[in-house]
């Protein structure tokens, strides 16, 4: 069964290559275990950026080498993607799955266009 997922249309990464956005879902039931996946769409190719499964009320746990971190509050997930460069500019899609208890629900947001601008190198101060 489809579930509505909302996320901002556009986000600009900061000068350190970090971008944050909120992914909000309309839960039809009372999920206790949720899986959040961030997908990147570029040139009609979709790749998985990161994923985390968490228990409601607990922290999101991404893999140690993940470029993502996040926190959850109710039906909102605050996602942060780090280490972005200009070449990483693209559409970042939030996918939410309610894993437990059943029934399974899945929703996909329309995507957040993240713009990343590489900082200008500092001029020599000679």
């Amino acid at each position: 069964k489809a579930m509505h997922v909302a996320q901002p249309a556009v986000v600009l990464a900061n000068s350190r290559g970090t971008a944050s956005f909120v992914c909000e879902y309309a839960s039809p039931g009372k999920a206790t275990e949720v899986r959040v996946t961030v997908l990147r769409q570029a040139d009609s190719q979709v790749t998985e950026v990161c994923a985390a499964t968490y228990m409601m009320g607990n922290e999101l746990t991404f893999l140690d080498d993940s470029i993502c971190t996040g926190t959850s509050s109710g039906n909102q997930v605050n996602l942060t993607i780090q280490g972005l460069r200009a070449m990483d500019t693209g559409l970042y899609i939030c996918k939410v799955e309610l894993m437990y208890p059943p029934p399974y629900y899945m929703g996909i947001g329309n995507g957040t266009q993240i713009y990343v601008i590489d900082p200008e190198p500092c001029p020599d101060s000679d």
């Epitope: 039931g29 499964t53 894993m99 208890p101 059943p102 029934p103």
Partner: antibody, heavy 114, light 112 residues
Framework: EVQLLESGGGLVQPGGSLRLSCAAS????????MSWVRQAPGKGLEWVSG????????GYADSVKGRFTISRDNSKNTLYLQMNSLRAEDTAVYYC???????WGQGTLVTVSS | QSVLTQPPSASGTPGQRVTISCTGS?????????VHWYQQLPGTAPKLLIY???NRPSGVPDRFSGSKSGTSASLAISGLRSEDEADYYC???????????FGGGTKLTVLG
């Protein structure tokens, strides 16, 4: 097309054991909660046991608690039900179901009789 | 005795509208969980008829509809047909049992 194929049923004496299997295909097995539901002859549906996608959460009906064990192997897309200390009242058709009984297998008959 | 209460039988004549109720409690339907309905034709495995309170899977005629309010849910069948003669079950997740609960089932008879 979703397919659930149960096997392992048969005739067993009271106190005996059986292991049911359910081979799943046509969907991402590892994403879904799976259950066993049974139906005694001429009776209604009874949820027996269920297991979450990761096997972290397992539940059992009071009538089978301590005797039945549910498990799954996501690499083999297979659900299991180990049934020990079987009683006459466990006689039923056992169905494998996905999610909250969205899809059903054709069932396997378990008969407990001496 | 089932956690969800359904009338054991219901009947109607072809073309009529029949409603089957399913009454639960605060640990299942009243807790906000979705109710699902199943149809079991004689000698066959049950089939999902309504999911998520009021949604029909593809292939299920729009003569079948579901609703939910408080701790109860209901299945309505309009334009009753002879092929609707079957057993109907409701089911929902139950917090206190940490599992799925089924109603006792309702045997629908199409008269005439």
């Amino acid at each position: 097309e979703v397919q659930l194929l149960e096997s392992g049923g048969g005739l067993v004496q009271p106190g005996g054991s059986l292991r049911l299997s359910c081979a799943a295909s046509g969907f991402t097995f590892s994403d879904y909660y799976m259950s066993w539901v049974r139906q005694a002859p001429g009776k209604g549906l009874e949820w027996v046991s269920g297991i979450s996608w990761s096997s972290r959460d397992k539940g059992y009906a009071d009538s089978v608690k301590g005797r039945f064990t549910i498990s799954r192997d996501n690499s083999k897309n297979t659900l299991y039900l180990q049934m020990n200390s079987l009683r006459a009242e466990d006689t039923a058709v056992y169905y494998c179901t996905t999610d909250l009984a969205r899809y059903w297998g054709q069932g396997t008959l378990v008969t407990v009789s001496s | 005795q089932s956690v969800l209460t359904q009338p054991p039988s219901a009947s109607g004549t072809p073309g009529q509208r029949v409603t089957i109720s399913c009454t639960g409690s605060s640990s299942n339907i009243g807790a906000g969980y979705d109710v699902h309905w199943y149809q079991q034709l004689p000698g066959t495995a049950p089939k999902l008829l309504i999911y998520g309170n009021d949604n029909r899977p593809s292939g299920v005629p729009d003569r079948f509809s579901g609703s939910k309010s408080g701790t109860s849910a209901s299945l309505a069948i309009s334009g009753l047909r002879s092929e609707d003669e079957a057993d109907y079950y409701c089911a929902v997740w139950d917090d206190s049992l940490n599992g799925v609960v089924f109603g006792g089932g309702t045997k629908l008879t199409v008269l005439g």
